[in-house]
């Protein structure tokens, strides 16, 4: 055994990392809210829109207290991976009417990807179990019409907004347990 290769620099403490993850999640939440408002302005929603392939909302705010750190991070990562896949699909197959949401939709995708990497790094640093994401779901079928793409966009942005809102609350609560 030889000497260590010089004094290592301190990387962010997992608690500080959780802080920056919360900030990133909040920023993504604001982006999503803004993009959803932009979509509503251009294409008003006629009621609620659902998409069967989207994950169900992980948890009600009231039930957050019982959560454990690994469960929150694992579920959040799985749900955000699904939303990332849906945003990629929307950009690829959403049709010309949704091109008006660029470059904001591209920025949203990049930030979502960054948040996912941050969550995985946090789980690694804490040495929490990291179950693999669910096996890839079958490819999403292209929307049947331009209006189908718009309805899908309403559902995706609405669901992502709720998930990120839940994520911020969950992460802040977990910080108190670290």
């Amino acid at each position: 055994p030889g000497p260590p290769p010089g004094p290592p620099r301190v990387s962010p403490d997992p608690r500080a990392e959780l802080d920056s993850t919360v900030l990133l999640t909040r920023s993504l939440l604001a982006d999503t809210r803004q993009l959803a408002a932009q979509l509503r302005d251009k294409f008003p929603a006629d009621g609620d829109h659902n998409l069967d392939s989207l994950p169900t909302l992980a948890m009600s705010a009231g039930a957050l207290g019982a959560l454990q750190l690994p469960g929150v991070l694992t579920r959040l990562r799985a749900d955000l991976l699904s939303y990332l896949r849906h945003v990629q699909w929307l950009r690829r197959a959403g049709g010309s009417s949704l091109k008006t949401l660029e470059p904001e939709l591209g920025t949203l995708q990049a930030r979502l990807d960054r948040l996912l990497r941050r969550l995985q790094l946090l789980m690694s640093r804490l040495a929490l179990p990291q179950p693999p994401p669910d096996p890839p779901a079958p490819p999403l079928a292209p929307p049947s019409s331009a209006w189908g793409g718009i309805r899908a966009a309403h559902a995706i942005l609405g669901g992502l907004h709720l998930t990120l809102d839940w994520a911020v609350r969950g992460l802040l609560l977990l910080k108190t347990r670290l």
Partner: antibody, heavy 114, light 111 residues
Framework: EVQLLESGGGLVQPGGSLRLSCAAS????????MHWVRQAPGKGLEWVAV????????YYADSVKGRFTISRDNSKNTLYLQMNSLRAEDTAVYYC???????WGQGTLVTVSS | QSVLTQPPSASGTPGQRVTISCSGS?????????VHWYQQLPGTAPKLLIY???ERPSGVPDRFSGSKSGTSASLAISGLRSEDEADYYC???????????FGGGTKLTVL
């Protein structure tokens, strides 16, 4: 400055036991998962065991399962590896590592030989 | 037999750019787990060089860069220097082990 100092290595006969310790300083030990990684002479790195930041999760490489036990004492900023039923193929430099791993100790040599 | 596959050796002349590859399986890189890279200079402990596929810890020169695409990852070293001569290891979380796995290591020689 981050420091991880391993101790407890040495020469032991096959079938014998050793307990390695790793004293941590310069970072919030209780917020990091900790690993033991080993390197046989002239060979590559092999992950041995990991323990979560709070000690609630412990996982082992198949090659040491049932023989080695990882533990930690957050009040003492110390990581341990209890090694039983040692074999010649366990001969290696054992590194204690924190996080990803982000930080590594200088290693302690364990030699299993009769 | 390492779970992640790396070429055993690589070489280049000073100033050149060298790339080291790392491929995995369905329980690690293919499952979307991030890849980390370590440098081990002769006679020393490993040092984290790249984390989360492409991030550099503070103090690591920007000559070192990482990338990941689908089933494999790579480490690129540009403007090669004699002090870069070392062993380089990739690592990723493996869901079947519930721990990290390492590549077999690549010995980089600066000619």
């Amino acid at each position: 400055e981050v420091q991880l100092l391993e101790s407890g290595g040495g020469l032991v006969q096959p079938g014998g036991s050793l307990r390695l310790s790793c004293a941590a300083s310069g970072f919030t030990f209780s917020s990091y998962g900790m690993h033991w990684v080993r390197q046989a002479p002239g060979k590559g790195l092999e992950w041995v065991a990991v323990i979560s930041y709070d000690g609630s999760y412990k996982y082992y490489a198949d090659s040491v399962k049932g023989r080695f036990t990882i533990s930690r004492d957050n009040s003492k900023n110390t990581l341990y590896l209890q090694m039983n039923s040692l074999r010649a193929e366990d001969t290696a430099v054992y590194y204690c590592a924190a996080g990803v791993p982000d930080y590594w100790g200088q290693g302690t040599l364990v030699t299993v030989s009769s | 037999q390492s779970v992640l596959t790396q070429p055993p050796s690589a070489s280049g002349t000073p100033g050149q750019r060298v790339t080291i590859s790392c491929s995995g399986s369905s329980s690690n890189i293919w499952s979307g787990y991030d890849v980390h890279w370590y440098q081990q200079l002769p006679g020393t402990a490993p040092k984290l060089l790249i984390y989360s596929n492409e991030e550099r810890p503070s103090g690591v020169p920007d000559r070192f860069s990482g990338s990941k695409s689908g089933t494999s990852a790579s480490l690129a070293i540009s403007g090669l220097r004699s002090e870069d001569e070392a062993d380089y290891y990739c690592a990723a979380w493996d869901s079947s082990l519930y721990g990290p796995v390492f590549g077999g290591g690549t010995k980089l020689t600066v000619l």
